[in-house]
Structure formats: structure tokens, C-alpha cells
Interface confidence: low
Amino acid sequence: PHLRTFTDRFQTCKVQGAWPLIDNNYLNVQVTNTPVLPGSAATATSKLTIIFKNFQECVDQKVYQAEMDELPAAFVDGSKNGGDKHGANSLKITEKVSGQHVEIRAKYIGTTIVVRQVGRYLTFAVRVPEEVVNAVEDWDSQGLYLCLRGCPLNQQIDFQAFHTNTEGTGARRLAAASPAPTAPETFPYETAVAKCKEKLPVEDLYYQACVFDLLTTGDVNFTLAAYYALEDVKMLHSNKDKLHLYERTRDLPGR
Amino acid sequence: SPCKILKCNSEFWSATSGSHAPASDDTPEFCAALRSYALCTRRTARTCRGDLAYHSAVHGIEDLMSQHNCSKDGPTSQPRLHTLPPAGDSQERSDSPEICHCEKSFHKHSATPNYTHCGLFGD
């Protein structure tokens, strides 16, 4: 999947299986990614687990889990708030669009999470205070935590180079550059560009990600995934000057 | 750099609202913030050898502890929660009848809350 980190680095990760996105004293988020096509290096998110840790008299530990074709509007225990404690309403789940869009607000840690199902796969977005991000017991033991450190270098796909190489080639594919088996030939570069332009008129990294995804999979739902990801940034990002990312911001992990 | 002293520093100054010389009746809270700060520096000590900001912090903590007669043992401030910024729009602060500290944490007292964003989508 495409990842935008807390430091506004933009990466395309081929990480497969379960990986931690966020891990701190209050919150743990883990994603499971699966290949989009058999034998493909490109992966998308098929499962998401969010654990809100027990916090004083505010909330009990609550676990939210979403999978492909299952986007519940409740925690795994069936509740929609923080439990029986006095401050239970400082954690709430709201269903925005049934089966497609859920918002979780954790007021006691100033955090808003948006989970969507777009096509077969899930998207995730979070707005969280830096103080919460940095609330960790031991920095030394922090492992690969994608939102903070980004993907390991050997798990990144340089989709910007792929985009550049494919530009203007029409239906021709640069197979060597492609991280996946060739998508259906009925989906030439020009069509991908047109589809993405429709939803993403600004040629930023979200637009480039959209083109990459369409060429990689031939699945038009990925256009919507990029579109909604940008919409979520507009809602959640505190710096309105950084909504669109353009330049290459890929960097070494952990920097 | 794996040395996280800047995080310890900013947490301490948030917790003390940037106050260099808290009033005497604030001392217990100030001491708790100092102990949290000291704990934070100890956690990052191994990766901070030779880091000037780290050692300046260590010395500063010792100095402030003695200036304010803080004991080394005692309560630490609850990490960051009394200084966390408000959670965004006004609607989300109006839908809860109880005003326990879970809600109080986010009454607006920071002009520019330091939020950050992460997102994951597509392939």
C-alpha cells in the first residue's frame, strides 16, 4: 500500500503480512497486507486491528477489527464507546456510510481515526497529537513502526520512477519496472491517467499513486482509494499547506 | 538520530507551560514534571552519549531539582495528558455530559496544537 508517514514522507510499501502502523502507550494499530494479484510485489490492506489501551477512569481496553467485506461500526465486544467507565464517551465509533466508512474519535487522547473499505481493500487515516505519538515507554525497543519510521528500504517500491518510465508509453508496459504481472492490456496508460485526472485533478503523489495502482491492477476502485485518502488528509492534516505532496520525499526509514 | 532528548525536552516544557520559575504553590506539580523529564532522559540515555542537548538536560534537571527542593522519588506527571491539545472541532466536545479529566484534557489551552497525520491506502 501507499503510506504517508507522520513526517509527511510518501512511500509505496510491498510489506506483506501483519505490520504495526502505530504503537504507543495509548494506541496500537496493526495492518495485514496481501498481494493484489498472484505473484505481485504490490500489496494492499486486507485487515486492520486497532487497540485502544485501558486508560485510567476514561476507557476500558477496546479492540476494533476490520477485514475485507467487513467494516463493523462497533468494537469486537459489540460496544460503540469506551465501556462502563465514567469517561466512556470520550471514545466513540460513528458509522458514516454503512459498510464503507467508519470514524473513531478518542477524545481523551485527541485522536481521530478514519477507516474505509474501498473496493476489496481497506484504507486507514489518523490525526493524532505528537504528544501521543511520542508516548512510548522505551524508544530503543521500538521496532518497525510504519507511521513513524516508514517502510524498510528493501520493502519500498519506487512508484515515482515507475510513473516516469511509463509516461507516454501508451499501452506498452515496462515490465522490468512493473512490480506486478502486467495488468489487463485493456487498461493503457492514457486511460489510467484520464481516470485518475477525473478524481484527482492536481498531479501530486496521490494522483501518481492512483496511476500506479491502475496500471498495476486494472482495478478502478483504486482511483477512489487515492481520492478518499486525499479527502481524509484534507480533513485530518493540521497543515493545510501540506495536503498535496509533490516532490520525492522518500527517505531512509527511521530518519 | 536515535537520541530522543528533544522529545523529553518538549514534553517537559509543555508540562510546565514553559515556566522557568513556577510559583511556590506549583512546586509539587513542577517536581512531578521534573521527575518525568528525568525518567525520559534515563530511557534515552544509551543512545544519547555525546549529545549536547542530552547532557544539558541532565545537568539542568539536577539543578532544578535542587533549586526547587524536589525529591528524586515521588509522583511523576501523567504523560502528556494534561497538556494534550483539543481534539479538533467543537462538536466533539459537546456530545458528552460528563466533564471528567478525559474531557478536560482537551479544553482549548493551546493556540497551535501539534497534530500529526498518517495514512495508508491503495497498493
Epitope: - | S1, S10, G50, D51, L52, A53, H55, S56, G60, L64
Partner: antibody, heavy 120, light 109 residues
Framework: EVQLVQSGAEVKKPGASVKVSCKAS????????ISWVRQAPGQGLDWMGW????????NYAQKLQGRVTMTTDTSTSTAYMELSSLRSEDTAVYYC?????????????WGQGTLVTVSS | QSALTQPRSVSGSPGQSVTISCTGT?????????VSWYQQHPGKAPKLMLY???KRPSGVPDRFSGSKSGNTASLTISGLQAEDEADYYC?????????FGGGTKVTVL
């Protein structure tokens, strides 16, 4: 009054070593780092490194690694900077400076400077 | 060559304002809260004028102020006075790198 008093001017031959002292008074010596900064004639300030009197830890400028040694003597509240294998371009005024305490990093008190001349 | 770039000189008449810039990279200036400024008169030791970008030590006149935008920190002297004629240096600390700017000569006309 917080003060840093440095040793007197030195004239050295190329290849020799020089050791400059910096005596602190008016504050708790171990509560602040000591930085060393030099300034060649007509040039700008050049950071050389820093030492923690509290722990003895040092942080040297990359270009001086292996040639510079900073030490402190807490019993006399004195910091020392030794530079070896001197060359003519090391001719400069050498300053010690106290580093602000706590989360702040700045040099708030400076010594008067020690002129070191390297000449054959 | 310093990694922090300052103009070689700036000048102004008494009472005017002058601004000295200090431009670095995101790591040396942009992400650093540790930016300080020093004044140095000929033959004298430097003197701290501002620290942590904007803070003024006691004894420094309030006509000295600091700011930062992106990768550039600035020192502004408003109401320039004859005794402000000196060299000014910015310093930034980020990680384990400590850098001085090349210095700016302020001339009071």
C-alpha cells in the same frame, strides 16, 4: 557573577600541542556543558566541540576528531582543551563558553579568549 | 564554507530596522529549535543575543528579535543604534551537529 577566565596567549611551533584552560566561577560547574569555539584572524566563529563536566562525555567537531581532547577538573572547576599536531591554520583565538542548562542549547557566558599562534 | 549562510554585510541608519538571515537545511535550521544569535564587537568575545530562535536573555534590549520561517532563521534589530555596529553570528544545533553561520557585519551609517 558567572565568569569564565582563560589562560594566557601561547606561541607554538607546527607539530606541537597546546593546552588552553578555562576556569569557571559563580555557578555549579557540573550543571552546564562547556563548548570550545575558535576564530582565526579576520574569520568567523568555528565550533570545536563540547564536554560535559558532569559525565566527562565529549562531542567533537568531525574535522578535529583525533587532534582535539577536552577534559575537565571538577575539583578546580576548570575545563581544558588540548589541540595536537598544530599547523599554521590553527592560529586563532580560542574561546570557552558555558552551554545553557536544561532543554535549551546556547552559549550564554564566554571566556575572554586565548590567542594561540602557530609559527615556525 | 559554513553550512549556514548569512549575508556578508547589512547596513542601516540610526533608528532604522535591519534583518539578518541565516539559511540552512531542514535538519540544520528547519527542524531545529536550537537557533541562537551572537554579537561580537572587534577584539571582544561573542555575546549571546537570542536563543531558541526568539528568546532574549536578560540584559539584551528588546529591539533585538528573532524569527524562523522554513529553513531560514532571522535576527531583526529595530531602532538601530551606534553600539549595534558589530558582527553577528547565527548558530544552530540539530542532532550532534553544531554550526555557526559565516557572520554578518552590521554597519550603522
Amino acid at each position: 557573577e558567572v565568569q569564565l577566565v582563560q589562560s594566557g596567549a601561547e606561541v607554538k611551533k607546527p607539530g606541537a600541542s597546546v593546552k588552553v584552560s578555562c576556569k569557571a566561577s559563580g555557578y555549579t560547574f557540573t550543571s552546564h556543558g562547556i563548548s570550545w569555539v575558535r576564530q582565526a584572524p579576520g574569520q568567523g566563529l568555528d565550533w570545536m566541540g563540547w564536554i560535559s563536566p558532569y559525565s566527562g562525555n565529549t562531542n567533537y567537531a568531525q574535522k578535529l576528531q583525533g587532534r582535539v581532547t577536552m577534559t575537565t577538573d571538577t575539583s578546580t572547576s576548570t575545563a581544558y582543551m588540548e589541540l595536537s599536531s598544530l599547523r599554521s591554520e590553527d592560529t586563532a583565538v580560542y574561546y570557552c563558553a558555558r552551554v545553557g542548562s536544561g532543554p535549551y542549547y546556547y552559549m550564554d557566558v564566554w571566556g575572554q579568549g586565548t590567542l594561540v599562534t602557530v609559527s615556525s | 564554507q559554513s553550512a549556514l549562510t548569512q549575508p556578508r554585510s547589512v547596513s542601516g541608519s540610526p533608528g532604522q530596522s535591519v534583518t539578518i538571515s541565516c539559511t540552512g537545511t531542514s535538519s540544520s535550521v528547519g527542524d531545529s529549535i536550537y537557533v541562537s544569535w551572537y554579537q561580537q564587537h572587534p577584539g571582544k568575545a561573542p555575546k549571546l543575543m537570542l536563543y531558541d530562535v526568539t528568546k532574549r536573555p536578560s540584559g539584551v534590549p528588546d529591539r533585538f528579535s528573532g524569527s524562523k520561517s522554513g529553513n531560514t532563521a532571522s535576527l531583526t534589530i529595530s531602532g538601530l543604534q551606534a553600539e549595534d555596529e558589530a558582527d553577528y553570528y547565527c548558530l544552530s544545533y540539530a542532532g550532534t551537529d553544531t554550526l555557526f553561520g559565516g557572520g554578518t557585519k552590521v554597519t550603522v551609517l
